[in-house]
C-alpha cells in the first residue's frame, strides 16, 4: 500500500509482536524490547576471535523468510532461529553453532520454532 496519503487500510492488518533484543536493539526499543510485524529471532555466531556471540531481536515481515533460513556461509559459523507464537518468544530460542564440518554446505532448513 502507498504510505503518502491516498491509500486505505489493508485487511486484515498484521498484529505487532514484541521481542527481546540484545546487541540488536533498534532506536525505538524500550527496556530491550523491540516491536515487529514479522518475527522474533535469536542468532549465535562466531566473532573475529572465534568466540560465540548471541544476538536477538526483531525481523520485519519483509524478507524475514530469507533471513530466518539458516543458510551456512563459507568460513562463518552461525545459526539463527525465529519464532512468532507469542511475545518475547525468542527468550526460549537457543540456537547452537553448527559443527565445523558443515561450514561448506550451501543450503539449510528454515528454523521456525
Amino acid at each position: 500500500k502507498k504510505e503518502d496519503g491516498e491509500s486505505t487500510a489493508p485487511t486484515p492488518r498484521p498484529k505487532i509482536l514484541r521481542c527481546k533484543c540484545h546487541h540488536h536493539c533498534p532506536e525505538d526499543s524500550v527496556n530491550n524490547i523491540c516491536s515487529t510485524d514479522g518475527y522474533c529471532f535469536t542468532m549465535i555466531e562466531e566473532d573475529d576471535s572465534g568466540m560465540p556471540v548471541v544476538t536477538s531481536g526483531c525481523l520485519g515481515l519483509e524478507g524475514s523468510d530469507f533471513q530466518c533460513r539458516d543458510t551456512p556461509i563459507p568460513h562463518q559459523r552461525r545459526s539463527i532461529e525465529c519464532c512468532t507464537e507469542r511475545n518475547e518468544c525468542n527468550k526460549d530460542l537457543h540456537p547452537t553453532l553448527p559443527p565445523l564440518k558443515n561450514r561448506d554446505f550451501v543450503d539449510g532448513p528454515i528454523h521456525h520454532k
Epitope: P14, E27, G60
Partner: antibody, heavy 117, light 113 residues
Framework: QVQLQQPGAELVMPGASVKLSCKAS????????MHWVKQRPGQGLEWIGD????????NYNHKFKGKATLTVDKSSSTAYMQLSSLTSEDSAVYYC??????????WGQGTTLTVSS | DIVMTQSPSSLAMSVGQKVTMSCKSS????????????LAWYQQKPGQSPKLLVY???TRESGVPDRFIGSGSGTDFTLTISSVQAEDLADYFC?????????FGGGTKLEIK
Amino acid sequence: QVQLQQPGAELVMPGASVKLSCKASGYTLTNYWMHWVKQRPGQGLEWIGDIDPSDTYTNYNHKFKGKATLTVDKSSSTAYMQLSSLTSEDSAVYYCARSGWDYFDSWGQGTTLTVSS
Amino acid sequence: DIVMTQSPSSLAMSVGQKVTMSCKSSQSLLKSSNQKNYLAWYQQKPGQSPKLLVYFASTRESGVPDRFIGSGSGTDFTLTISSVQAEDLADYFCQQYYRIPWTFGGGTKLEIK
C-alpha cells in the same frame, strides 16, 4: 461490525478499587492488542497500557504501574482494567481501544469513572 | 517519554475554508528500517469517543473523507482539512506510536464560524 462495549458510568468511593470492562465483538479478540486510555474532563488523552489477548502479555505506561492492572477473559471476549487505591485524580473517562499496529482503529464509548464519597 | 505538541490549541473556521493544524514531536518518529513515520491523527466529536483518521502520518483510514490529509515527516506533522464542513467540529489529537509509552498531543479544538 467491530464493537467495543463499555458500561456508561461507575461511582466508587475513595480508597476502593474498580474493575472496568470492555466486551469485544465483530472480530477475533486474539488478533488485536487491547489498549486503555484515560481522558480527564477538558483534557487530552493518556495511554495507560495494553494487553495482547493471545498470551496476556502486557505493557504499561510507567505512570500507571501499580495503579492499573490489565487482564482478559477470552471465553467472554472481554478485557478488564482494575484501578486500585482510587482518588479524585482517577475520576475520568476511560476508553478501551484495539490495535493491530499501535494506532487505535476502534474505540469503546468510554466509561465515566467518578471517585467520590 | 516522547512529548507531542499541537498548535494551535483552538481555531475557528468557516465552512469551505482550508484548515491546517500542526503536531510536533520531541524526537523523530521516522523508523529507519521501513521509512515510515509512526504518527496517527484522531478526531473526537463532542460527547463521542475518538475516531482514527490517519496513520503512518499520511495513510487515510478506510471510510475517512479525502478532505482529511496527513503530511510531514520526522518531527513535524500537519493535518489539513481541504474544505472544512460543519460536521468537522471536533477536537483533533495526534499520537506517536514510535516508542512506548504511546503519547498524545494536547489537541486542537476546531470550531465552525
